[in-house]
Interface confidence: medium
Amino acid sequence: PSTLTQKHNNSSLNTRTQKACHCGHCPEEWITYSNSCYYIGKEKRTWAESLLACTLKNSSLLSIDNEEEMKFLTAISPSTWTGVFRDSSQHPWVTINGLTFKHEIKDSDNAEHNCAMLHARGLKSDRCGSSKIYHCKHKL
């Protein structure tokens, strides 16, 4: 296999991503990565239900700030809702913070697919009413 070098701890591993550590800053059963806490949901919910569930946990539905975070999250759970959506196929993709999402979202040409999920090292559109695992994120 190829070699992955992690500069964070100067070690070489034959895995594709960093190990998520359980640190004191995050609630129990949440994981820490790069100054954020992540709740890894075990149950499947629609996009709107997932949004609400995260709000009730004083956090937000999974947002992905950069490509390295995406690589990390994909390795944990390759199919999960993200906080990226659009009002319709005629509207741009935006984040739950109201920012335009500028990266590629696969299958965007499907007019019924208006919510985005993490999928195979990227984002893919799907029906907002379909049930998926959800993750929540809270920045430290």
Epitope: T5, K7, N66, E68, H103, G122
Partner: antibody, heavy 118, light 107 residues
Framework: EVQLVESGGGLVKPGGSLRLSCAAS????????MNWVRQAPGKGLEWVSA????????YYADSVKGRFTISRDNAKNSLYLQMNSLRAEDTAVYYC???????????WGQGTLVTVSS | AIQLTQSPSSLSASVGDRVTITCRAS??????LAWYQQKPGKAPKLLIY???SLKSGVPSRFSGSGSGTDFTLTISSLQPEDFATYYC?????????FGQGTRLEIK
């Protein structure tokens, strides 16, 4: 317009070293993983190495592990490949290629030829 | 490492023909497969990603299908500019690997 321009290729003796560069423009370089891919004359494509956007994740093919080092300078929008202990079988056109989030190589440079011969 | 085997290695066809190239992975790679076109002296060009998604700007006569281990690139009606070498690539896991290529020639 996205542009990737490789440089630094040339003729080098077996056991020698060479440093390739890839100058990027037309996109936010610091948001993308970058890769080196090579192609020996008349042969197919071979992935060589990858580096994530902030250099946290670095990957190598077994054929170059321990000899090649990938790096990047986001301030200079540049990707590098330091090649040491070069062998005849490293002779190839070397391409740099950009990764979009979760996508394969959507943009490639024009390539730079490395020839390892005595 | 995951090995990709393309078939055929070379293919002769005429303008207007329907052409199919296959790519088989040595182990399952979900839908994480791309197809590239390369012309002599030029860099490869991405055609298809995620097994079946057409890259923006690529003509609709190109299509991809498959998942798991068996994948197909189809050109529905060959045009003169389509004669080139085609490569599949898996991006499911490192090391990333390419198929050996399929050379598409004019009959």
């Amino acid at each position: 317009e996205v542009q990737l321009v490789e440089s630094g290729g040339g003729l080098v003796k077996p056991g020698g070293s060479l440093r390739l560069s890839c100058a990027a423009s037309g996109f936010t370089f610091s948001s993308h993983s970058m890769n080196w891919v090579r192609q020996a004359p008349g042969k197919g494509l071979e992935w060589v190495s990858a580096i994530s956007s902030s250099s946290s994740y670095i990957y190598y093919a077994d054929s170059v592990k321990g000899r090649f080092t990938i790096s990047r300078d986001n301030a200079k929008n540049s990707l590098y490949l330091q090649m040491n202990s070069l062998r005849a079988e490293d002779t190839a056109v070397y391409y740099c290629a950009r990764e979009e989030w979760g996508l394969p190589f959507d943009y490639w440079g024009q390539g730079t030829l490395v020839t390892v011969s005595s | 490492a995951i090995q990709l085997t393309q078939s055929p290695s070379s293919l002769s066809a005429s303008v207007g023909d329907r052409v199919t190239i296959t790519c088989r992975a040595s182990q399952g790679i979900q839908s994480a497969l791309a197809w590239y076109q390369q012309k002599p002296g030029k860099a490869p060009k991405l055609l298809i990603y995620d097994a079946s998604s057409l890259k923006s700007g690529v003509p609709s006569r190109f299509s991809g299908s498959g998942s798991g281990t068996d994948f197909t690139l189809t050109i529905s009606s060959l045009q003169p500019e389509d004669f080139a070498t085609y490569y599949c690539q898996q991006f499911n896991s490192y090391p990333l690997t390419f198929g050996q290529g399929t050379r598409l020639e004019i009959k």
